[in-house]
Amino acid sequence: SVRVEQVVKPPQNKTESENTSDKPKRKKKGGKNGKNRRNRKKKNPCNAEFQNFCIHGECKYIEHLEAVTCKCQQEYFGERCGEKSMKTHSMIDSSLSK
């Protein structure tokens, strides 16, 4: 029942792992139903070493997994949203359209 895709573990350094918190800091509610309004810490890797990680997508840090993932823009996929999905036509399709 577990499916994992496009996830990268940021390198752990000691000071980071010692900085545990009782609760992630929340943004004010609102926007996108308030979902993902949490979790905007100074140590968010998406704002540091992973800020340019997602080529055609949005970097997201998942605290539970201590991992970074990319939410790709439409038509892009891959670990870093660097691959574009191409719509291909078969030989039959192209011959029918002539």
Epitope: Q6, P24, E58, T69
Partner: antibody
Framework: EVQLVESGGGLVKPGGSLRLSCAAS????????MSWVRQAPGKGLEWVST????????YYPDSVKGRFTISRDNAKNSLYLQMNSLRAEDTAVYYC??????????????????WGQGTLVTVSS | DIVMTQSPDSLAVSLGERATINCKSS??????????LNWYQQKPGQPPKLLIY???NRESGVPDRFSGSGSGTDFTLTISSLQAEDVAVYYC??????????FGQGTKLEIK
């Protein structure tokens, strides 16, 4: 086969301390966030604490914050809950639970997919 | 905090009949068309068991008479044809990334 086995429960006086343990087996422990959930006698489920895969992030409800501390030892496949300043209202069966998850298209969906049998904590003078 | 409220508190249904349990959240648990809502079954003397995750996905091994539906703030667990072994307490739980990770108060399902 995934197994979670809690231990450390018992009778303790108000203001006392107790340390619960959860021994995990049958899965890659350091790939999953883990939680403690409790259930007072005859009552519903109450989330108590969560810890991230490597222990860098911990979460608590206001009811236990400052009194309870969750930790994990990935080398020993073990989860812990240190409970201090215990109160009568902390009396409950404490369950250890694994966070199963789906991660796709930038979305993270999680749920408690495996639970231990629980350990009873009784706080009474 | 997101508050989860289940209805009814208890329910008696005849064997073979449909059972419906509702769960309402104090604010939306949806994001971009995804619902962050799970259902659990707890039989007497046992730990809870995951039935449905992400509102409508049945956990492996769960009989297909169990189904989940809904979005936003309103969700439903349906048992299409009640069996004797379905007698239990059922809980909904929101699994947004926002703690506290709250449960509903539970619905006790019995046989009429």
């Amino acid at each position: 086969e995934v197994q979670l086995v809690e231990s450390g429960g018992g009778l303790v006086k108000p203001g006392g301390s107790l340390r619960l343990s959860c021994a995990a087996s049958g899965f890659t422990f350091n790939s999953y966030a883990m939680s403690w959930v409790r259930q007072a006698p005859g009552k519903g489920l109450e989330w108590v604490s969560t810890i991230s895969t490597g222990g860098s992030h911990t979460y608590y409800p206001d009811s236990v914050k400052g009194r309870f501390t969750i930790s994990r030892d990935n080398a020993k496949n073990s989860l812990y809950l240190q409970m201090n300043s215990l109160r009568a209202e902390d009396t409950a069966v404490y369950y250890c639970a694994r966070h199963g998850y789906l991660l796709y298209d930038g979305y993270y969906e999680w749920y408690f997919d495996y639970w231990g049998q629980g350990t009873l904590v009784t706080v009474s003078s | 905090d997101i508050v989860m409220t289940q209805s009814p508190d208890s329910l008696a249904v005849s064997l073979g009949e449909r059972a419906t349990i509702n769960c309402k959240s104090s604010q939306s648990v949806d994001y971009d068309g995804h619902s962050f809502l799970n259902w659990y079954q707890q039989k007497p003397g046992q730990p809870p068991k995951l039935l449905i995750y992400a509102a409508s996905n049945r956990e492996s091994g769960v009989p297909d008479r169990f189904s989940g539906s809904g979005s936003g703030t309103d969700f439903t667990l349906t048992i299409s044809s009640l069996q004797a072994e379905d007698v239990a307490v059922y809980y909904c739980q929101q699994s947004t990334e926002d703690p506290p990770y709250t449960f509903g108060q539970g619905t006790k399902l019995e046989i009429k």
